[in-house]
Interface confidence: low
């Protein structure tokens, strides 16, 4: 039987009446144009909604926007357009919301052609009040907040100037001209690339990388011949042009660009690219594009310094620079990532890793599903997940995979069951153990969201027709109830719930269409009365993550430790609550070869945990370039995986000697770096 239709599904008592009392409609006094929604702060209940409507006139486009504010999670909205002097707000800049709970908001206004600069509206009290500020420049990008101090803002101008404000946008100063890309680093540091000759495009590969640690009082050139740069975790990466030809290589720094090392990664040509797929303070996943327009490349995982890389996955699907990849961090379980590979016959298959890229496997076939016609063997096939690439290809996939750190183990995604991703209409699948096992949750495509840290899952069918029904589950997608939230169906445009999945409110957005007009409408449903009581100790059960063999003493060991979680029982209908904190008990594991990656000059043959010397390096001294010095490596081939906490057990020997010899990296060596002050 279909999920949610078997006899074991008990109904939630009197839910229709409970939800009806907690369903709030708001009709916006707007013609339907576009709508964008932002949450201001965490657990504040404050939502800003910006609606914009373009009237195309013969000579120009006339725009009108309205700003609405809710402070009760979307149940009621107040029109606050007068606070921004009824100004038309530029939607391409969105609403720049400050970090953490700063309560800061910046809106960028549309200004007439001849004006000296742009205009912003600033709020530092969760959008209760706004201050209008005229800018001495026209912004090219959205204002960027420093992660450490929300009063510090940076922006690029249409003339490629780098502008900084130290008082939340009240006063602005141009600290550098000819800037291509600027990013905040840690400790209020700004990294940016500059061009010397014509433009960013013309100087690509000849850019300079600069750093300022004092908001523009002084500068240091930390790199030359730069193509691009990126920040990930504690790593600063730069792709640098080679001296001799048009190839480029990745260099990495862990000290804000004072010293650099060449990453042991393949160089790439003009048409290829590097991409940081994921990074944390321990390591980085790097994609290196294949030569030619293949649409795939190789994933490499780094060591703890970002220098030595192990090949993680071949034929990784990634279409073009800035194109589509399905790489997804499953945030509900440590070490889990999902992505797609392009097989030899050009079909797309999903792969999953449970150990941060150490090994990749296919997803296990869901118990309650049959293999489709993509499968050669009807009894043996896998689940294949639809993500960004499927969405870009306009397949019938309304949403990417979903996981939340505080909904432990839960992953929801569209998928098909066979030997490859199918063009057929997908179904929705759920895993409650971080991707090890899967179950078909809903027939056909749906929008879905997680509420109350996994206590409730909400879904709406993806349909071209107007809808008025929402589905919800209180047992991690096993059983579903349906609730008709309005008599008059609406054209659905999106589900909105507060980021972090702690809320019990869901907003259904859409528009109503009549013969003469169409209007935005939202329905906010509060599920607090469905989960009547607070969860108690008896509602939780102990769950060992990554458990595959309970008989094995090392069961659940991933990256050197195992974790036991307290998880809500599926049968318990209660509130985790907004203050819910994931309870976990870690325990250290003994080291095995699985806890080590292969060192520079070594590789792991398939289906083998031992690292063996690369044939071309056999008998050679292993020397590599580190911080501009040549290092001699004495190793038996192993290096501990970044973030691995194992102790005891296997302990391979490793020693690095400084050869006290300079080695050439075509990058700027430390002594050549210059500084200057303003």
């Amino acid at each position: 039987s279909a999920p949610g239709e078997d006899e074991e599904c008990g109904r939630v008592r009197d839910f229709v009446a409970k939800l009806a009392n907690n369903t709030h409609q708001h009709v916006f006094d707007d013609l339907r144009g576009s709508v964008s929604l932002s949450w201001v702060g965490d657990s504040t209940g404050v939502i800003l909604v910006l609606t914009t409507f373009h009237v195309p006139l013969v000579i120009m486009t006339f725009g009108q926007s309205k700003l609405y504010r809710s402070e009760d999670y979307g149940k009621n909205f107040k029109d606050i357009t007068d606070l921004i002097n009824n100004t038309f707000i530029r939607t391409e800049f969105g609403m720049a919301i400050g970090p953490e709970n700063s309560g800061k908001v910046v809106l960028t206004a549309e200004v007439s052609g001849g004006s000296r600069g742009g205009r912003i509206f600033r709020s530092s009290d969760f959008a209760k009040n706004f201050v209008q500020t005229d800018l001495p420049f026209h912004p090219l990008t959205q204002m960027m907040y420093s992660p450490q101090n929300s009063d510090y803002l940076l922006a690029l101008s249409t003339e490629n100037g780098l502008w900084v404000s130290k008082n939340f946008g009240g006063k602005w100063e141009e600290i550098h001209k000819a800037v291509c890309l600027a990013k905040w680093g840690s400790d209020n540091t700004i990294f940016f690339t500059t061009y010397a000759n014509g433009s960013c495009k013309a100087d690509l590969g000849a850019l300079e990388l600069w750093r300022t640690s004092d908001l523009g009082k002084s500068f240091k050139t930390i790199g030359v011949k730069i193509y691009s740069f990126g920040l990930g975790g504690r790593f600063l990466f730069a792709s640098v042009m080679a001296d001799k030809d048009t190839t480029r290589r990745i260099h990495v720094s862990t000290d804000q660009g004072d010293t650099w090392s060449m990453a042991q990664l393949p160089s790439v040509g003009q048409e290829q690219f590097y991409s940081i797929l994921a990074a944390n303070d321990d390591m980085v996943f790097m994609h290196v594009d294949e030569p030619g327009d293949t649409g795939f490349g190789t994933i490499f995982t780094s060591d703890d310094r970002g220098i030595v890389y192990s090949k993680s996955l071949d034929r990784h699907l990634y279409t073009t620079t800035g194109g589509e990849t399905d790489f997804t961090n499953v945030t509900s379980l440590r070490g889990v990532y999902i992505t797609s590979v392009l097989s030899e016959d050009n079909s797309i298959q999903t792969m999953i890793t449970f150990d941060q890229g150490g090994r990749w496997t296919h997803l296990r076939k869901p118990e309650n599903s049959e293999c489709d016609a993509t499968a050669k063997n009807k009894n043996e096939c896998s689940l294949h997940i639809h993500a960004s690439y499927s969405i870009s290809q306009k397949l019938n996939v309304p949403m990417a995979p979903l996981s939340e750190p505080n909904a432990v183990g839960i992953v929801i995604a569209h998928g098909s069951v066979g030997d490859a991703i199918s063009v057929m209409v997908p179904d929705v699948y759920i895993s409650d153990d971080g991707g090890y096992s899967w179950t078909k949750m809903l027939e056909g495509p749906h929008y879905y969201t997680i509420l109350d840290s996994g206590g409730i899952i909400v879904a709406i069918e993806h349909s071209s027709r107007p809808i008025n029904v929402i589905k919800f589950s209180t047992d991690e997608g096993q059983c579903w109830q349906t609730y008709t939230f309005t008599r008059d169906p609406i054209y659905f445009t999106g589900l909105a719930s507060e980021p972090g999945a702690r809320s019990m409110n869901i907003s259904i957005w859409g528009f109503t269409e009549s013969f003469l007009t169409s209007q935005w409408v939202s329905y906010t449903i509060d599920f607090k009365d469905i989960l009547e009581r607070n969860c108690e100790e008896k509602d939780y059960t102990i769950w060992l993550a990554h458990s595959t063999d309970p008989e094995d003493y090392e069961d659940g060991c991933i990256l050197g430790y195992k974790e036991q979680f307290l998880r809500l029982r599926k049968s318990s209908v209660c509130q985790n609550g907004r203050d819910y904190v994931v309870t976990k008990q870690p325990s250290i594991c003994l080291c095995s070869l699985e806890d080590f990656l292969c060192d520079f000059g070594y590789y792991r043959p398939e289906n083998d945990s031992k690292c063996v010397e690369q044939p071309e390096l056999k008998g050679h001294d292993l020397e590599f370039c580190l911080y501009g010095r040549e290092e001699h490596l004495t190793t038996n081939g192993y290096r501990k995986i970044p973030g691995d906490k194992c102790q005891g057990g296997v302990n391979p020997v490793r020693e690095v000697k400084d050869l006290k010899k300079k080695c050439t990296s075509n990058f700027l060596s430390p002594e050549k770096q210059n500084s200057k002050s303003n």
Partner: antibody, heavy 129, light 107 residues
Framework: QVQLVQSGAEVKKPGASVKVSCKAS????????MSWVRQAPGQGLEWMGI????????SYAQKFQGRVTMTRDTSTSTVYMELSSLRSEDTAVYYC??????????????????????WGQGTTVTVSS | EIVMTQSPATLSVSPGERATLSCRAS??????LAWYQQKPGQAPRLLIY???TRATGIPARFSGSGSGTEFTLTISSLQSEDFAVYYC?????????FGGGTKVEIK
């Protein structure tokens, strides 16, 4: 040999429904997809949708969404196409065609497409009051 | 949806001559393209798949070329049995779509 045999001609009134069958033989029925294509008098070919005979999942062209239903019976190796709320402009010859590579989403390079390699003889449906 | 445009609508050729039929896609279909031949009162017949591969039993005088958005079907030396309507069809993205057809008639 591989063949697809369709049901006979039908005459229907506007607003009625028609159900056309297509019986496959000479190959493993569930191993490959089946498309339905129609051709109005003097007009070109128009793709209506596709069914996976193994799992029964379907994908329909937007134009026919809500009016067309494709089903299959694996015990008789037959696929069916039902079109409801018939109008005069639905008068056409309806073909089933084996579509071996409706199977996987295309990669960014080319997925190999094998074409609709076997066609039924066609079923004429006339809608007239 | 991807729109397929065939040209010319009608092509008049003498037997023994070469015929070149064009098919253009509104966006790239890579090589996910097939050509079909249809004679009056008959079902279409697959000629070319994968843009350039001849289907089983199709004579060597039929050849397909192109990739992306521009495709060509060439009949090197027309035989009397080749006078028919020819359709191209893409299968890059659903819904599959056909061109309007090119009628090859005797000059």
């Amino acid at each position: 040999q591989v063949q697809l045999v369709q049901s006979g001609a039908e005459v229907k009134k506007p607003g009625a429904s028609v159900k056309v069958s297509c019986k496959a033989s000479g190959y493993t029925f569930t191993s490959t997809y089946m498309s339905w294509v129609r051709q109005a008098p003097g007009q070109g070919l128009e793709w209506m949708g596709i069914i996976n005979p193994y799992g029964g999942s379907t994908s329909y062209a937007q134009k026919f969404q809500g009016r067309v239903t494709m089903t299959r019976d694996t015990s008789t190796s037959t696929v069916y196409m039902e079109l409801s709320s018939l109008r005069s402009e639905d008068t056409a010859v309806y073909y089933c065609a084996r579509d071996p590579s409706g199977i996987a989403a295309a990669g960014p390079a080319s997925r190999y497409y094998y074409g609709m390699d076997v066609w039924g003889q066609g079923t004429t449906v006339t809608v007239s009051s | 949806e991807i729109v397929m445009t065939q040209s010319p609508a009608t092509l008049s050729v003498s037997p023994g001559e070469r015929a070149t039929l064009s098919c253009r896609a509104s966006q790239s279909v890579s090589s996910n393209l097939a050509w079909y031949q249809q004679k009056p009162g008959q079902a279409p017949r697959l000629l070319i798949y994968g843009a350039s591969t001849r289907a089983t039993g199709i004579p060597a005088r039929f050849s397909g070329s192109g990739s992306g958005t521009e495709f060509t079907l060439t009949i090197s030396s027309l035989q009397s049995e080749d006078f028919a309507v020819y359709y191209c069809q893409q299968a890059r993205l659903g819904p599959w779509t056909f061109g309007g057809g090119t009628k090859v008639e005797i000059k």
